[in-house]
């Protein structure tokens, strides 16, 4: 996260660390006891590592009362992603067992409604992402507020040229941005899962580059599917 | 203590501009979005919009563009909101409005002390 | 835009009394915010995200709702609840107040 600072301890009981071989590696997001939502991309990345899910975190490092680490009983990305696209950026992983719930471990309620955010609302990104263009990773979560940006504009030739389907959204990435590591994570606005930010390689903090974030919404089908 | 200190009471004529001021203090300016409100004599609050200390970003409520101008002075910790070409439907008590707390249920946390704005000629 | 209708605009009730407030969305929002304003004073923050009462709010009060429908209310009213509450949305841009709830004190 660029741009942001230090989240309320424990104020975001879904927000999850998908981690390999015991590093942090993306955000993810509980949105059921026993699944999180995450991006596809994050496997690719993961190669042959033992893939587990942090739930109940503020700091990587610390001994917390509510962290516990599920092992993944079942990765599951979109049928559709692919490598070298950014397109159906998502991941459903099934935790080993139920996640035991409690005020520092919550599912989020994601939108099912397929309409567009209205653009500059304001929207909550959180993650354990880079902090600086230097790479510097946080141990503790970060979070920042981001303006939902129009289509149209995201998707001028200055900025991502076409690129942003109606399945996606952007945020503004005026010095503050989601960036490497967050990916994954979740973009909730007024309180719901609305996106979770892709994991493409893209420029972070640039504002002719804004964050890219695959609308939960339009994968309403699939996700019941999986879920069920 | 966290505050928002609003510049004193605006007599304009109609047609005029004018420029309030929001002073924050006790907190890191740049970190937090500013927002601002009329409240109109029914008592009705209308959200005008918000500008971002760290970048300029703005957004404006379709009802207020063309109608208010929002900025800031890092340097000072201050935020600005001009009002131009005005009317006696301007006439109304202005605040600038903050969330200051880092939970991803954002509302207005802290107001500004306000400033009332007449037009009349 | 979201449209937020409060009622009942005048509240009248006794010290000791139960009162609830609502507040109406015309179209589904997933939380409310509630301010508390009194006469000269600026606008307070009172309950936040439908049900967690703001610093130094008194646990009398109470939020609750889902969906288009939400509401405010005090279990036992004290004569320093005498003010105006306004419900306000934040799921979607330009956020919007509701037109106030003005309890008077019998």
């Known amino acids: 996260i660029l741009g942001g600072r230090e989240a309320e301890a424990h104020a975001r009981p879904y927000m999850a660390s998908v981690q390999v071989n015991g590093e942090h590696l993306c955000g993810g997001v509980l949105v059921a006891e026993q699944w999180v939502l995450s991006a596809a991309h994050c496997l690719e990345d993961a190669a042959d590592g033992k893939v587990q899910v942090l739930l109940g975190a503020h700091s990587l490092s610390q001994p917390e009362p509510s962290k516990r680490l599920y092992d993944v009983l079942r990765a599951v990305p979109h049928p559709d992603s692919r490598p070298d696209t950014i397109d159906h950026d998502l991941l459903l992983l099934q935790l080993s067992e139920k996640a035991t719930l409690g005020p520092a471990v919550r599912p989020l309620p994601w939108q099912r409604v397929d309409r567009d955010v209205e653009p500059g609302t304001l929207c909550d990104v959180a993650g354990w992402g880079i902090v600086s263009h230097a790479g510097r990773r946080p141990d503790r979560l970060q979070h920042v507020l981001l303006p939902v940006l129009d289509r149209a504009t995201c998707n001028r030739r200055t900025h991502h040229d076409g690129a942003i389907t109606q399945r996606m959204m952007c945020a503004e990435s005026n010095r503050r941005d989601s960036c490497k590591g967050d990916s994954g994570g979740p973009l909730v606005c007024g309180g719901v899962l609305e996106g979770v930010v892709t994991s493409g390689s893209r420029v972070c903090g640039n504002r002719k580059k804004p964050g890219i974030y695959t609308r939960v919404a339009s994968y309403a089908a699939w996700i019941d599917s999986v879920l069920a | 203590e966290v505050q928002l200190q609003q510049s004193g009471p605006e007599l304009v004529k109609p047609g005029a501009s004018v420029k309030i001021s929001c002073k924050a203090s006790?907190?890191?300016?740049?970190?937090?979005?500013m927002h601002w409100v009329k409240q109109s004599h029914g008592n009705i609050l209308d959200w005008i919009g918000y500008?971002?200390?760290?970048?300029?970003?703005?957004s404006y409520n379709q009802k207020f563009k063309g109608k208010a101008t929002l900025s800031v002075d890092q340097s000072s910790s201050t935020a600005y909101m001009e009002l131009r070409s005005l009317t006696s439907e301007d006439s109304a008590v202005y605040y600038c409005?903050?969330?200051?707390?880092?939970?991803?249920?954002?509302?207005?946390?802290?107001w500004g002390t306000g400033t009332r704005v007449t037009v009349s000629s | 835009q979201i449209v937020l209708s409060q009622s009942p605009a005048i509240l009248s009730a006794s010290p000791g009394e139960k009162v609830t407030m609502t507040c109406r969305a015309s179209?589904?929002?997933?939380?409310m915010h509630w301010y508390q304003q009194k006469p000269g004073s600026s606008p307070k923050p009172w309950i936040y995200?439908?049900?967690n009462l703001a610093s130094g709010v008194p646990t009398r009060f109470s939020g609750s709702g889902s969906g288009t429908s939400y509401s405010l209310t005090i279990s036992k009213l004290e004569a320093e609840d005498a003010a105006t509450y306004y419900c306000?949305?934040?799921?979607?841009?330009?956020?919007?107040f509701g037109g106030g709830t003005k309890l008077e004190i019998k």
């Open positions: 179209s589904s929002v997933s939380y």
């Open positions: 006790g907190y890191s300016f740049t970190d937090y979005y």
């Open positions: 306000q949305q934040w799921s979607s841009n330009p956020y919007t």
């Open positions: 995200a439908t049900s």
């Open positions: 500008i971002d200390p760290y970048n300029g970003v703005s």
């Open positions: 409005s903050s969330y200051y707390g880092s939970s991803p249920y954002w509302y207005f946390d802290v």
